[in-house]
Amino acid sequence: SGTTNTVAAYNLTWKSTNFKTILEWEPKPVNQVYTVQISTKSGDWKSKCFYTTDTECDLTDEIVKDVKQTYLARVFSYPAGNVESTGSAGEPLYENSPEFTPYLETNLGQPTIQSFEQVGTKVNVTVEDERTLVRRNNTFLSLRDVFGKDLIYTLYYWKSSSSGKKTAKTNTNEFLIDVDKGENYCFSVQAVIPSRTVNRKSTDSPVECMGQEKGEFREI
């Protein structure tokens, strides 16, 4: 059942990176508008993106309240200009989204190498601790704050003159690696949540190489 001349939304898809979370759907509306509702499994429905002609709705503010909860959304279709109209069952047409658990499913954003410093044959590489939109005590939490030791970083590093990539790992945001004296190295990092089965890894950070401005070299 449903409203005359409206079609139900379909292909409801969660797009989420570092907890910035948007629900997308189809089709582009023709003479209809949409309203989105979201709830946890045990909670009440909350309406968002009222009577919109968009086919996406930013639900970040709702999911960051508890990123470990599982959320369900639904998209209601209404005839444009007659949003009070309901179908024969007395309720507008709607479609449910897949369930979404932000902590387990949000994509890990591309990390950034903040700095690297060489001291003799050791290099300290620091990964930027990216800020998320998750709040605690009115403060935005970093990715490390949210994931704790569940989040690790893999460092790929290689001599500028060579192709083989060595790896190092950390459950902080810092690496301390051994390098050969007099050699220039390049670095790239990847965020990983090993306990996950899907969306385990981020894309790689941009490559940073020694001899560029981000680094600092000290001969000891």
Partner: antibody, heavy 120, light 106 residues
């Protein structure tokens, strides 16, 4: 169920080439690192090399560097070991193994192995 | 490359015995050490991060670390435990294995 299945082994003459495949099921290889490990008859385990299928990064043991190439096809969920300029000492059972990319990176799943014999 | 020196290379023991195998890393590897069991066929993971029991592995297997020394202990050897055991470090690339310890029936 997580599974790794190697294929492509066989008898090859010294100087010859062979390509081994490692077909994965039950997980997506782009989320992990895939290693190749070999074991000569009656000997211990020797690491050969790895690939991160998400970016194509590789690293090889000195004993195979320049002769062996690891690649991956994420659409087929399969990793490959291309072996060129084969020598008698490359005779071994070749295993692929999954690295969960945690801090200690244990190889949590292994294939059954495929035997490569280099002999004239 | 980091060397993993495993000892003994073989040992004979009886069912019910307590068995200890050690591995010494040539430099610091933190806790990035795993232990594998191999019967004919592919190795199987027993212990990871030096002391964590892998899922489905009997609790008679345990691992410990003291500095660069790592130990695999089988508290009470069972008939199915007769096999070859390998340690492995993956603290740095390349990962390296110990030479193996063959546990045989006395």
């Amino acid at each position: 169920e997580v599974q790794l299945v190697e294929s492509g082994g066989g008898l090859v003459q010294p100087g010859g080439s062979l390509r081994l495949s490692c077909a994965a099921s039950g997980f997506t290889i782009s989320g992990y690192i895939i290693h190749w490990v070999r074991q000569a008859p009656g000997k211990g385990l020797e690491w050969v090399g790895y690939i991160d299928p998400s970016n194509g990064y590789t690293y090889y043991a000195d004993s195979v560097k320049g002769r062996f190439t690891i690649s991956a096809d994420t659409s087929k969920n399969t990793a490959y070991l291309q072996m060129n300029s084969l020598r008698a000492e490359d005779t071994a059972v070749y295993y692929c193994a999954r690295d969960d990319q945690s801090l200690s990176s244990p190889f949590d799943y292994w294939g059954q192995g495929t035997l490569v014999t280099v002999s004239s | 490359d980091i060397q993993m020196t495993q000892s003994p290379s073989s040992l004979s023991a009886s069912v019910g015995d307590r068995v200890t195998i050690t591995c010494r890393a040539s430099q610091d590897v933190n806790t990035a050490v795993a232990w594998y069991q191999q019967k004919p066929g592919a190795p199987k993971l027993l212990i990871y991060s030096a002391s964590f029991l892998y899922s489905g592995v009997p609790s008679r297997f345990s691992g410990s670390r003291s500095g660069t020394d790592f130990t695999l202990t089988i508290s009470s050897l069972q008939p199915e435990d007769f096999a070859t055991y390998y340690c492995q470090q993956h603290y740095t690339t390349p990962p390296t294995f110990g030479q193996g310890t063959k546990v045989e029936i006395k």
